[in-house]
């Protein structure tokens, strides 16, 4: 047993059939020695008496908001919250696998620069009595400081007959210089409780791993006198980390005819500009990458031809 | 520890071209050692992160953009002194700060090649004759170090008269990949900000 | 693979024009970025125009901006570089390259296929 907050403790069970579960002493936070009884969670029944109790933990129903009394008054409680272990693996029943970049990926991060701010989302299909605690650092045996805000409800999807619910989090690494070469990586800490079950999810990367910038910005076509072409020009997305010579960008420009079976054209290029011949009822779409990195590119920019 | 804006001579900075080379050559031999070395420990996941050139040269401080002096974090009290003969800007009107970050540049690619030469020699000697250097990311190397034209004293390759580990060896290589993969980022970027400069 | 031929170089006076082709032999030319690249005596090969695999996307130098224009006729395997207003700037061995995604900007080292070169000589 541990304790995740003040008066919030974690019992840690292997969960199989007939298992023997966890004996756990609680002990009542008050100088009264006397009179004391327990209770658990709305019942009024007494399950015991004395200034400590001892209960055998073996499933959800014995976990709860344990309280003592003396003569109708509440001295204290202690909130008892259920960890399962599966044929030695933690449980993972409150997070959906995202299965990208890979199975078993709970929290996925990104960023849009170099600045050491970052987003991680994940996704759950409950609704209701679900709490999230996010905490971050660089490294781990001598962590340095990352600081989150709270996760909040970001999205919400319908799956076939499930609703999906998305949450998110953003963190900033308190002391980050956007040119440094990482070595330690970052790694975020997810608790989740749902009722009286508590899990918790991580997640360990390299800032640079995990960049994926903001699509270009002011996609713009020109036309060429005297011809069918026109200049496609486009330029850094502002939330790119600066100055952009040395955090430089490089771009995929696609040029797709009005149905989908129409062979598509792209090139790759450092600039910021290129000419295309402009087809009814095509478009032209833009997006970038590191240039010299590659993690993900960002998501199209696009513009139609007429 | 800054880059003063400075005004090359006209024409391609002559060092982007080979530095380009060089994060193109290091980023194929990481590939292929990834795919050689499959049943090893040799992604970015599985190994420690190493450099070898820490406490020894100050590439990211000494080549740091004027625009990222400002921010607090990115200035580290590391002082190295370094030779400061570079010829890379092909320009008398190479800076002091300048010449200590090309020469910092060159230091981090004396001891890498070093590193690399030494651990060839002993993959040669492996009987599975698994994974050897990429000659071509060896005299890429070579060229950008020949483009820096710093002058200074050749290192000797390191000899070891005990019977290497392989197994060591090729994790080693991994790391010494990945760091060097990241140094050539810098490496990139810095030659991509005097080019533009 | 593909293997490449340029021909249409020679002399020509300044402002006049020239039509360089670069013909290919290879089934897989429509595969292929193309690219028409320049070198001068006692310089670097620098990149002219290049053209996407479908003709559809092309990028100038920004010297020659205005002035060259490049296109294709995959059904004859063939790349041009029509070259008009010429200055004796333009003096040159012009090459033609070709590579399946090369990362346009970047140089001739993007390109792993090259044609032997046509002289362009354009006198004052």
């Known amino acids: 047993i541990w304790e995740l907050k003040k008066d919030v403790y974690v019992v840690e069970l292997d969960w199989y059939p007939d298992a023997p579960g966890e004996m756990v002493v609680l002990t009542c936070d008050t100088p009264e020695e006397d009179g004391i009884t327990w209770t658990l969670d709305q019942s009024s029944e007494v399950l015991g008496s004395g200034k400590t109790l001892t209960i055998q933990v073996k499933e959800f129903g014995d976990a709860g908001q344990y309280t003592c009394h003396k003569g109708g008054e509440v001295l204290s409680h202690s909130l008892l919250l259920l960890h399962k272990k599966e044929d030695g693996i933690w449980s993972t029943d409150i997070l959906k696998d995202q299965k990208e970049p890979k199975n078993k990926t709970f929290l996925r991060c990104e960023a849009k620069n170099y600045s050491g701010r970052f987003t991680c989302w994940w996704l759950t299909t409950i609704s209701t009595d679900l709490t999230f605690s996010v905490k971050s650092s660089r490294g781990s045996s001598d962590p340095q400081g990352v600081t989150c805000g709270a996760a909040t409800l970001s999205a919400e999807r319908v799956r076939g007959d499930n609703k999906e619910y998305e949450y998110s989090v953003e963190c900033q690494e308190d002391s980050a210089c956007p040119a440094a070469e990482e070595s330690l990586p970052i790694e975020v800490m997810v608790d989740a409780v749902h009722k009286l079950k508590y899990e918790n999810y991580t997640s360990s990367f390299f800032i640079r791993d995990i960049i994926k910038p903001d699509p270009p910005k002011n996609l713009q076509l020109k036309p060429l006198k005297n011809s069918r072409q026109v200049e496609v020009s486009w330029e850094y997305p502002d939330t790119w980390s600066t100055p952009h010579s040395y955090f430089s960008l490089t771009f995929c420009v696609q040029v797709q005819g009005k149905s989908k079976r129409e062979k598509k054209d792209r090139v790759f290029t450092d600039k910021t500009s290129a000419t295309v011949i402009c087809r009814k009822n095509a478009s032209i779409s833009v997006r970038a990458q590191d240039r010299y990195y590659s993690s993900s590119w960002s998501e199209w920019a696009s513009v139609p031809c007429s | 520890r800054n880059l003063p804006v400075a005004t090359p001579d006209p024409g391609m900075f002559p060092c982007l071209h080979h530095s380009q080379n060089l994060l193109r050559a290091v980023s194929n031999m990481l590939q292929k050692a990834r795919q050689t070395l499959e049943f090893y420990p040799c992604t970015s996941e599985e190994i420690d992160h190493e450099d070898i050139t820490k406490d020894k040269t100050s590439t990211v401080e000494a080549c740091l953009p004027l625009e990222l002096t400002k921010n607090e974090s990115c200035l580290n009290s590391r002082e190295t002194s370094f030779i400061t003969n570079g010829s890379c800007l092909a320009s008398r009107k190479t800076s002091f700060m300048m010449a200590l970050c090309l020469s910092s540049i060159y230091e981090d690619l004396k001891m890498y090649q070093v590193e690399f030469k030494t651990m060839n020699a002993k993959l040669l000697m492996d009987p599975k004759r698994q994974i050897f250097l990429d000659q071509n990311m060896l005299a890429v190397i070579d060229e950008l170090m020949q483009a820096l034209n710093f002058n200074s004293e050749t290192v000797p390759q390191k000899s070891s008269l005990e019977e290497p580990d392989f197994y060591k060896t090729k994790i080693k290589l991994c790391i010494l990949l990945h760091a060097f993969r990241i140094r050539a980022v810098t490496i990139d970027r810095v030659m991509s900000y005097l080019n533009a400069s | 693979e593909v293997q490449l031929v340029e021909s249409g170089g020679g002399l020509v006076q300044a402002g006049g024009s020239l039509r360089l082709s670069c013909a290919s032999s290879?089934?897989?030319?429509?595969?292929?970025?193309m690219g028409w690249f320049r070198q001068a005596p006692g310089k670097e090969r620098e990149s002219v125009a290049t053209?996407?695999?479908?003709?559809?996307?092309?990028d100038y130098a920004d010297y020659v901006k205005g002035r060259f224009t490049i296109s294709r006729d995959n059904a004859k395997n063939t790349v041009y570089l029509q070259m008009d207003s010429l200055k004796p700037e333009d003096t040159a061995v012009y090459y033609c390259?070709?590579?399946?995604?090369?990362?346009w900007g970047r140089g001739p080292d993007e390109y792993d296929t090259w044609g032997q070169g046509t002289q362009v000589t354009v006198s004052s």
């Open positions: 390259a070709a590579a399946r995604s090369p990362v």
């Open positions: 290879g089934r897989t030319f429509s595969n292929y970025n």
């Open positions: 053209i996407s695999r479908s003709g559809v996307i092309t």
